[in-house]
């Protein structure tokens, strides 16, 4: 009886460990990459370019919405506006496909873009983008929902200047007027690879699997002075800002127009410095925890001197420190994961060895003749299950 239970135990141990190992192998694919604990309030579908469903493994079902500026927000799939938005994006995608567009509707659960870069993160969101390519960086952006245009000054600067009618400064925080609260995940870089979207809006031609909505037509002739940037009508996209008081809210990261020194920008940008040195394959585990969100600092217009990087330059955070505490922890990359698995395998082999020795000892104590201890075969020893048995187990030597 005892030897049987021991061998059963051995089998169980082997099975469990192999399961763990396999689970580890598969970990990058099935684990929950985006955890939503807070859902965004309404976002116009005009500003959205994709949606995706989070993985079943996340437990709480959520729709991840991507805006035209590649920021991600969690939304409640049960809300009517979310249903309407998804429907609209589906129709748009279908229309584009019919019109010979290159949109590929990708079915399946989401694996976030491999290079989640620059973007705002908001309360109660845990992201675990699994990077496999370029260095990944996350750029937190302000979450004061209705800061006025503020002429681009950095949101965390408590300038204390109240604006007059023409300046863009913060009215009441958007929480009061129904805007998304504490929900933004991160901004995705314009070009990336391997994302599986459940459904989304028109996909423009290009290297990325994601709709970048870049115009594909040839630039029109223009004055030399206008050659800086051109957009011509043959290619649609959903981007837009808003009116009234220049406000930048939740997911926005205005580029300041003032020439402040970096030290003046407050403590938040320091958080993102960690990202600058992340090598390829780095993963970020970002936990954004809410902090008090009482007020939105006023900002006044300032003259030229751009400080913050463009969306493609994934450094420096611009975020309202009153609303957010961002905990950004680099997670070991793929090599580290491999190392962990190797260690696990060794531990497993060690365990097997110990079990083998234990069994051997046990059987010896049971009085099995030494000669029945078995033969050697490629580093493994065949051990009889019991003294009179002709069934064997393998144990490493």
């Amino acid at each position: 009886m005892a030897p049987i239970s021991l061998s059963w135990l051995l089998r169980l141990a082997t099975f469990c460990h192999l399961t763990v190992l396999l689970a580890g192998q598969h970990h990058g694919v099935t684990k929950c990459n985006i955890t939503c604990s807070k859902m965004t309030s309404k976002i116009p579908v005009a500003l959205l370019i994709h949606y995706q469903q989070n993985q079943a493994s996340c437990g709480k079902r959520a729709i991840i919405l991507e805006t035209r500026q590649h920021r991600l927000f969690c939304a409640d799939p049960k809300e009517q506006w979310v249903k309407d938005a998804m429907q609209h994006l589906d129709r748009q995608a279908a229309a584009l496909t019919r019109n010979g567009g290159t949109f590929e509707k990708q079915i399946g659960e989401v694996k976030p873009r491999t290079t989640p870069a620059a973007g705002g993160m908001d309360e109660s969101v845990v992201l675990e983008p699994e990077a496999t390519g370029e260095s990944s960086s996350l750029e937190p952006t302000p979450s004061s929902q209705e800061a006025q245009r503020a002429l681009g000054t950095s949101p965390e600067l408590p300038t204390g200047v109240t604006g007059s009618s023409g300046t863009r400064l913060p009215p009441t925080p958007k929480a009061q007027d129904g805007g998304p609260v504490g929900t933004e995940l991160f901004r995705v870089p314009p070009v990336s690879t391997a994302a599986t979207w459940q459904s989304s809006a028109p996909h423009q031609p290009g290297p990325s699997l994601w709709a970048e909505a870049k115009t594909s037509e040839a630039p029109s002739t223009q004055d030399p002075s206008t050659q800086a940037s051109t957009a011509s009508s043959p290619a649609p996209e959903e981007n837009a800002p808003s009116e009234g008081q220049r406000v930048w809210g939740q997911g926005q990261s205005p580029r300041p127009e003032n020439s402040l020194e970096r030290e003046e920008m407050g403590p938040v940008p320091a958080h993102t410095d960690a990202f600058q040195d992340w090598g390829p394959g780095s993963m970020a585990h970002v936990s954004v925890v809410p902090v008090s969100s009482e007020g939105t600092p006023s900002r006044e217009p300032v003259a030229s001197g751009s400080w913050t990087p463009k969306a493609e330059e994934p450094i420096h955070a611009t975020m309202d420190p009153q609303r957010l505490g961002v905990l950004i922890t680099p997670v070991p990359d793929a090599q580290a994961a491999t190392r962990r698995q190797a260690v696990g395998l060794l531990a497993f082999l060690g365990l097997l060895f110990c079990l083998g020795v234990a069994m051997f000892t046990y059987q010896s104590l049971q009085g099995c003749p030494r000669k029945m201890a078995g033969e050697m075969a490629e580093g493994l020893r065949y051990i009889p299950r019991s003294c009179g048995s002709n069934s064997y187990v393998l144990v490493p030597v």
Epitope: G152, G179, E243, R246, V247, P301
Partner: antibody, heavy 122, light 107 residues
Framework: EVQLVQSGAEVKKPGATVKISCKAS????????IHWVQQAPGKGLEWMGW????????KFNERFKGRVTITADKSTNTAYMELSSLRSEDTAVYYC???????????????WGQGTTLTVSS | DIQMTQSPSSLSASVGDRVTITCRAS??????LAWYQQKPGKAPKLLLY???TLSGGVPSRFSGSGSGTDYTLTISSLQPEDFATYYC?????????FGGGTKLEIK
């Protein structure tokens, strides 16, 4: 103070092309979308399209698609709207307007240019 | 495309009157609606937007209400400077569309 100053009135012949400018000041030009809105005489307002200076991702109203080009010169903080193959029904006042790049609020237009009158007549 | 139907197209009222202008969308716009005031020869001016938020510098006599597809702009007590044309605009989906306008005239 945020200001959008548009170029002067234009008179064009059918089939011609017009290019209207909109010079922005008082805010970071590349942060905010520029929208163009048409208002034909005695008619309502019609949104033509948006453009974020420095970003090649415009969006156009299908009605104007293929005839409209929006460009921007970041060095002078000026946006341009070019309308080609003009016809008499393009006679209207054209406004540039902006909205913040808030990724959640949407595009209501808080600042407007003074408007540019375009007359298309043979 | 979402069509915006404004009514009435014109309205005569006196100073001190309470005035209501309605705007109906052909589909749900989830409160992404803005109201503008335009005076002859001038550019439109934003009054209210999303969830009836009053734009900066706009007097509190202007208010908005509604949900789903039906929205209203109310001026609680007309002032001489309020005589103008009013437009609603949906910005839920593109193309953004405006109502046909309501011309508010002095009775």
């Amino acid at each position: 103070e945020v200001q959008l100053v548009q170029s002067g009135a234009e008179v064009k012949k059918p089939g011609a092309t017009v290019k209207i400018s909109c010079k922005a000041s008082g805010y970071t030009f590349t942060n905010y979308y520029i929208h163009w809105v048409q208002q034909a005489p005695g008619k309502g307002l019609e949104w033509m399209g948006w453009y974020l200076p420095g970003d090649d991702s415009p969006k156009f109203n299908e009605r104007f698609k293929g005839r409209v080009t929006i460009t921007a010169d970041k060095s002078t903080n000026t946006a341009y709207m070019e309308l080609s193959s003009l016809r008499s029904e393009d006679t209207a006042v054209y406004y540039c307007a902006t909205s913040p790049t808030d990724e959640t609020q949407g595009d209501y237009f808080d600042y407007w240019g003074q408007g540019t009158t375009l007359t298309v007549s043979s | 495309d979402i069509q915006m139907t404004q009514s009435p197209s014109s309205l005569s009222a006196s100073v001190g009157d309470r005035v209501t202008i309605t705007c109906r969308a052909s589909g749900r716009i989830h409160d992404f609606l803005a109201w503008y005031q335009q005076k002859p020869g001038k550019a439109p001016k934003l009054l209210l937007y999303t969830d009836n938020t009053l734009s900066g510098g706009v007097p509190s006599r202007f208010s908005g209400s509604g949900s789903g597809t039906d929205y209203t702009l109310t001026i609680s007590s007309l002032q001489p400077e309020d005589f103008a044309t009013y437009y609603c605009q949906q910005f839920w989906s593109t193309p953004y569309t405006f109502g046909g306008g309501t011309k508010l005239e002095i009775k």
